[in-house]
């Protein structure tokens, strides 16, 4: 099958997931497409521990994650439940700000320079993080 048992070259393994950190920017949709072409998805942050791991690798740079509300409610790209899941928004965020003058509000979430999240215009060319989970079958310990 296509299940992964180890991370691809230039990806970083952490807690049974593989992460790839871009060094150039793309709009959110193009970043999403890029991750999909890697058989992965934009990073889905499910814990404070994962937040700190990603934050450590991206540094103080605006970076897209796999969270958006382009169709109404906030949704993670892998289907993880937003309402009950981990969140790390900056104070007063998300605010769907219309004052940027670029048309529309702000529908895509990114890590800010301090790691906390902000919603922003999806067309901004930010860096991004791809994530793919390692094969669950390979997590099971061998039989003795």
């Amino acid at each position: 099958g296509s299940e992964r048992t180890c991370c691809p070259v230039n990806w970083v393994e952490h807690e049974r997931s593989c992460y790839w950190f871009s060094r150039s920017g793309k709009a959110w949709a193009d970043a999403d497409n890029y991750c999909r072409l890697e058989d992965a998805h934009l990073v889905v942050v499910t814990s404070w521990e994962e937040q700190k791991f990603v934050q450590h690798h991206i540094g103080p740079v605006n970076t897209w994650m796999g969270l958006h509300d382009q169709n109404g409610p906030w949704k993670w790209v892998d289907g993880t439940d937003y309402e009950t899941g981990f969140k790390n928004w900056r104070p007063e965020q998300p605010d769907d700000w219309y004052g940027h003058g670029l048309g529309g509000g702000e529908d895509c979430a990114h890590f800010t320079d301090d790691g906390r999240w902000n919603d922003d215009v999806c067309q901004r060319p930010y860096r991004w993080v791809c994530e793919t989970e390692l094969d669950k079958a390979s997590q099971e310990p061998p039989l003795l």
Partner: antibody
């Protein structure tokens, strides 16, 4: 040595079908997205389609969407392009190419000619 | 779709000349740009990726620069084997698109 070899081209009537193959060797095929790029006689390059390494994700140029299907068999290190409802404007040399992380194409096959004519 | 334009469409030059080809994108593509060389009857060959990174095995006389919408391919000292057609390709978003090409021929 890294190598790509296309086959399956030929003469076909408008409305007909053709299936192109691209045999890969010299690299871990399943780890790389693969693409088809075409070049009409005397013209420039036109990107056609791309497929992720695991075969889960595809993208197509609007000019072929709904008519062409890209697929792969990782157990045989082979990429395919199924071309249906062919038109005269599909006449071109078709290249398969290996994608890099910068979304460039670093390895190309020699190409296979597809001629659509009655 | 992002449109790519190249100039000039053709250039006549001599061995040893410095040749510069420009490529412009219809919208910003950051550094998501590649350059290819193609000779008649042959497949394209990758020269430059990420706007300025030299592909392994490509002579150092080839260089790329630019960011956003304007990009340049420079051949510092043209060699006999460099007479070919050169294409740029944007890799920022689907569909990937190529420039129309620049033919470099002998003066």
């Amino acid at each position: 040595e890294v190598h790509l070899l296309e086959s399956g081209g030929g003469l076909v009537q408008p409305g007909g079908s053709l299936r192109l193959s691209c045999a890969a060797s010299g690299f871990t095929f399943s780890s790389y997205a693969m693409s088809w790029v075409r070049q009409a006689p005397g013209k420039g390059l036109e990107w056609v389609s791309i497929l992720s390494g695991g075969g889960k994700t595809t993208y197509y140029a609007d000019s072929v969407k709904g008519r062409f299907t890209i697929s792969r068999d990782n157990s045989k290190n082979t990429l395919f392009l199924q071309m249906n409802s062919l038109r005269a404007e599909d006449t071109a040399v078709y290249y398969c190419a290996k994608r890099t992380p910068s979304d460039a194409f670093d390895i190309w096959g020699q190409g296979t000619m597809v001629t659509v004519s009655s | 779709d992002i449109q790519m334009t190249q100039s000039p469409s053709s250039v006549s030059a001599s061995v040893g000349d410095r040749v510069t080809i420009t490529c412009r994108a219809s919208q910003g593509i950051s550094d998501w740009l590649a350059w290819y060389q193609q000779k008649p009857g042959k497949a394209p060959k990758l020269l430059i990726y990420a706007a300025s990174s030299l592909q392994s095995g490509v002579p150092s006389r080839f260089s790329g620069s630019g960011f956003g919408t304007d990009f340049t391919l420079t051949i510092s000292s043209l060699q006999p084997e460099d007479f070919a057609t050169y294409y740029c390709q944007q890799a920022n978003s689907f569909p990937f698109t190529f420039g129309p090409g620049t033919k470099v021929d002998i003066k």
